[in-house]
Amino acid sequence: QDEDFKASDDLTSISPEKRFKVSISGTEVVVTCPDVFGYDNIKWEKNDNLVEGASNRELSQKEFSEVDDSGYYACYADSIKEKSYLYLRARVCANCIEVN
Amino acid sequence: FKVSVEELEDRVFLSCNTSVLRIEGTMGIQLPHSRTLDLGKRILDPRGIYRCNATEEQSDKAPYMQVYYRMCQNCVELNSATLA
């Protein structure tokens, strides 16, 4: 299911394109870089280490592990001064759905 | 100037070398006499966007940190029995 971030109250928020999107379905977790980079080449870091071969806005982990894959994620581009950071901790399961 | 996320027992804490500024999301509780924001229990899935407090001159050195927890407390396993 889609788990987009939502503001929890009416405090002035930053624009939606500056947020990461996190989508979780079964054991797959997809993190989408904020839409501030336009058509620039994107790089990803996980816990300050470059993620080799990741150059798209989406970073996908098919078998996400709460222990190994939770942590700090950052995406950045040559034309943007700031890195965008996400601290993600997710518990996943193969055959389950989340109910509210 | 980067927000750090720490877990102590079952709670989530954000800290900075200054103080933590909440942009949106989980309110949290500022711990007295400290530079730490308590976001509460991790099983409650705290989520939000935060950054370190900085002067105007230094604000461009304080990046945003989005926090996203999904601890699957309300997850239901689908098996033949559940689907029946």
């Epitope: 336009g38 080449n41 798209n56 581009a77 040559d78 034309s79 | -």
Partner: antibody
């Protein structure tokens, strides 16, 4: 030494088409996003279109969406701008630029005139 | 959409220092480029990423950026520096340009 050489500009009638080319040298072409910027006579500068290093992501300004297409051939170190359904307001000098948002080098430009 | 504000014109006496400003909300959080356009010529990037000079650009050109203002400084302006100067930032994929500042070098 970085070089960007644009070509393909011409006088064309409204609703006509043109294809601009920009040949790059002096840097690893596929490592860089590329951009097309235009300047109408006596006017300011405007980003027209951009494309990332492997060609998978593109950007267009609203005024040209659906009419212009940016593409690249990394084997030929060339970026293209296919311009269809041209209008009088597309008349401008078109510049090729290295980079996306922080371009550090522009070409000399090629002139596109749309007139009946 | 993001907006950049530049003074329409700046005058400087020959060999004196000129400052051209570019204002934008929290512009210090973005990279700024400065583009020089001599009348009748193609634009040339003279500063990129706030303060970097491309190869061949004289040292008298320098850039700074913090808070809500970016500044291009020309130390010891020469007659050949008479031109239009545009500031530019990347914002959500698009490029945003200032309206341009016409620099006049007074002899």
């Amino acid at each position: 030494e970085v070089q960007l050489v644009e070509s393909g500009g011409d006088l064309v009638k409204p609703a006509g088409s043109l294809r601009l080319s920009c040949v790059a040298s002096g840097f690893t072409f596929s490592d860089y996003s590329m951009s097309w910027v235009r300047q109408a006579p006596e006017k300011g500068l405007q980003l027209v279109a951009g494309i990332n290093g492997d060609g998978s992501t593109t950007y267009y300004t609203d005024a040209v969406k659906g009419r212009f297409t940016i593409s690249r051939d990394n084997a030929k170190n060339t970026v293209y701008l296919q311009m269809n359904s041209l209008r009088a307001e597309d008349t401008a000098m078109y510049y090729c630029a290295k980079g996306a948002g922080t371009g550090d080098f522009w070409g000399q430009g090629t002139l596109v005139t749309v007139s009946s | 959409s993001y907006e950049l504000t530049q003074p329409p014109s700046v005058n400087v006496t020959l060999r004196e220092t000129a400052h051209i400003t570019c204002g934008g909300a929290s512009i210090g959080r973005k990279y700024v480029q400065w583009i020089q356009q001599i009348p009748g010529q193609a634009p040339v990037v003279i500063i990129y990423k706030d303060s970097n000079r491309p190869t061949g650009i004289p040292e008298r050109f320098s850039g700074a950026n913090s808070g809500n203002t970016a500044t291009l400084t020309i130390s010891g302006a020469l007659a050949e520096d008479e031109a239009d100067y545009y500031c530019q930032v990347g914002d959500s994929g698009a490029w945003v340009f200032g309206e341009g500042t016409q620099l006049t070098v007074l002899r």
